[in-house]
Interface confidence: medium
């Protein structure tokens, strides 16, 4: 499998403490929208799922930073294509999910890797920890 760490800003959403509580409406609905969005973006067979969605405050707390890990079958996609396909979807994300996306950053994730190799992110990602958000677990609500 190939893993990619992806980070982006949602500039039209306000960060608040509900995004630090995974049992709230705000957290669950945003996670659902993002999961569905990625299933739309990477429809090709190589996409396996995403995990470790994390929400953080953007600059000044006026936006939401989303961080997550994407998994693909080995050799089906590279960093450049992951970023390109995501950037190409930004307009549709705005109209379909009302998410204004900016500051996209994608990087390779060596797998497995230790906490030290992620430079303080503390998001240790291991095979047995993957919590897939797959298509059949989500019902479109738009």
């Amino acid at each position: 499998m190939s893993f990619f760490f992806l980070s982006f800003h949602i500039s039209n959403l306000q960060f608040n403490s509900s995004l630090e509580d995974p049992s709230t409406d705000y957290y669950q609905e945003l996670q659902r929208d993002i999961s569905e969005m990625f299933l739309q973006i990477y429809k090709q067979g190589g996409f396996l799922g995403l995990s470790n969605i994390k929400f953080r405050p953007g600059g000044g707390g006026g936006s939401v930073v989303v961080q997550l890990t994407l998994a693909f079958r080995e050799g089906t996609i590279n960093v450049h294509d992951v970023e390109t396909q995501f950037n190409q979807y930004k307009t549709e994300a705005a109209s379909r999910y009302n998410l204004t996306i900016s500051d996209v950053s994608v990087s390779d994730v060596p797998f497995p890797f230790s906490a030290q190799s992620v430079d303080g992110l503390n998001d240790i990602f291991e095979a047995q920890k993957i919590e897939w958000h797959e298509l059949e677990h989500h019902h479109h609500h738009h």
Epitope: D21, S23, D25, N122
Partner: antibody, heavy 116, light 109 residues
Framework: EVQLLESGGGLVQPGGSLRLSCAAS????????MSWVRQAPGKGLEWVSG????????YYADSVKGRFTISRDNSKNTLYLQMNSLRAEDTAVYYC?????????WGQGTLVTVSS | QAVVTQEPSLTVSPGGTVTLTCGSS?????????ANWVQEKPGQAFRGLIG???KRAPGTPARFSGSLLGGKAALTLSGAQPEDEAEYYC?????????FGGGTKLTVL
């Protein structure tokens, strides 16, 4: 002052039902997710169920799924736990807890005893 | 359902430092597990100390801090006080449920 007051516990036979209530005061109840947590006699804590601030999302431990139902009435500042098909292993003190940064405030608990 | 493990008991000297840990049967604990730490003292209501891995609940003394350490969640108590003698429980979030650990009995001696 934040206060959570549980009620509705008691002695019930196996297979019976109980409805627990948790009356909240001292904070804006409708903006907080809430949970029920229990502690069996001489044991540690076990999370039972949780609910999002509007009640749109509910969560259950595997041990109670299909038997317990969590709900809330934000107009009454009250959290509920409907417990059906009770078993001896459900015997415990049941606590309601608020969740913003950790389970920060807890009630004093209500004792549920399931015995014939 | 995942199993969350804690040290059954630990002892610290007054003024000393101690670290309680919280491990997961599914692998390394991450920030996505939103580790929580709860304190239980006899005759008192439970009290949340730390949520979201490292955020202190209102009223939590600064001597308590939360972090991730070696693939586990950790609660560090720096400058232990006699009143810190208690049972400490951690809880981890797994997608749609919380799981508590068995608790650590901390003795200040």
């Amino acid at each position: 002052e934040v206060q959570l007051l549980e009620s509705g516990g008691g002695l019930v036979q196996p297979g019976g039902s109980l409805r627990l209530s948790c009356a909240a005061s001292g904070f804006t109840f409708r903006v907080y997710a809430m949970s029920w947590v229990r502690q069996a006699p001489g044991k540690g804590l076990e999370w039972v169920s949780g609910i999002s601030e509007t009640g749109s999302y509910t969560y259950y431990a595997d041990s109670v799924k299909g038997r317990f139902t969590i709900s809330r009435d934000n107009s009454k500042n009250t959290l509920y736990l409907q417990m059906n098909s009770l078993r001896a292993e459900d015997t415990a003190v049941y606590y309601c807890a608020r969740y913003p940064y950790g389970f920060d405030y807890w009630g004093q608990g209500t004792l549920v005893t399931v015995s014939s | 359902q995942a199993v969350v493990t804690q040290e059954p008991s630990l002892t610290v000297s007054p003024g000393g430092t101690v670290t309680l840990t919280c491990g997961s049967s599914t692998g390394a604990v991450t920030t996505s597990n939103y580790a929580n730490w709860v304190q239980e003292k006899p005759g008192q209501a439970f009290r949340g100390l730390i949520g979201g891995t490292n955020k202190r609940a209102p009223g939590t003394p600064a001597r308590f801090s939360g972090s991730l350490l070696g693939g586990k969640a950790a609660l560090t108590l720096s400058g232990a006080q006699p009143e810190d003698e208690a049972e400490y429980y951690c809880a981890l979030w797994y997608s749609n449920l919380w799981v508590f650990g068995g608790g650590t009995k901390l003795t200040v001696l």
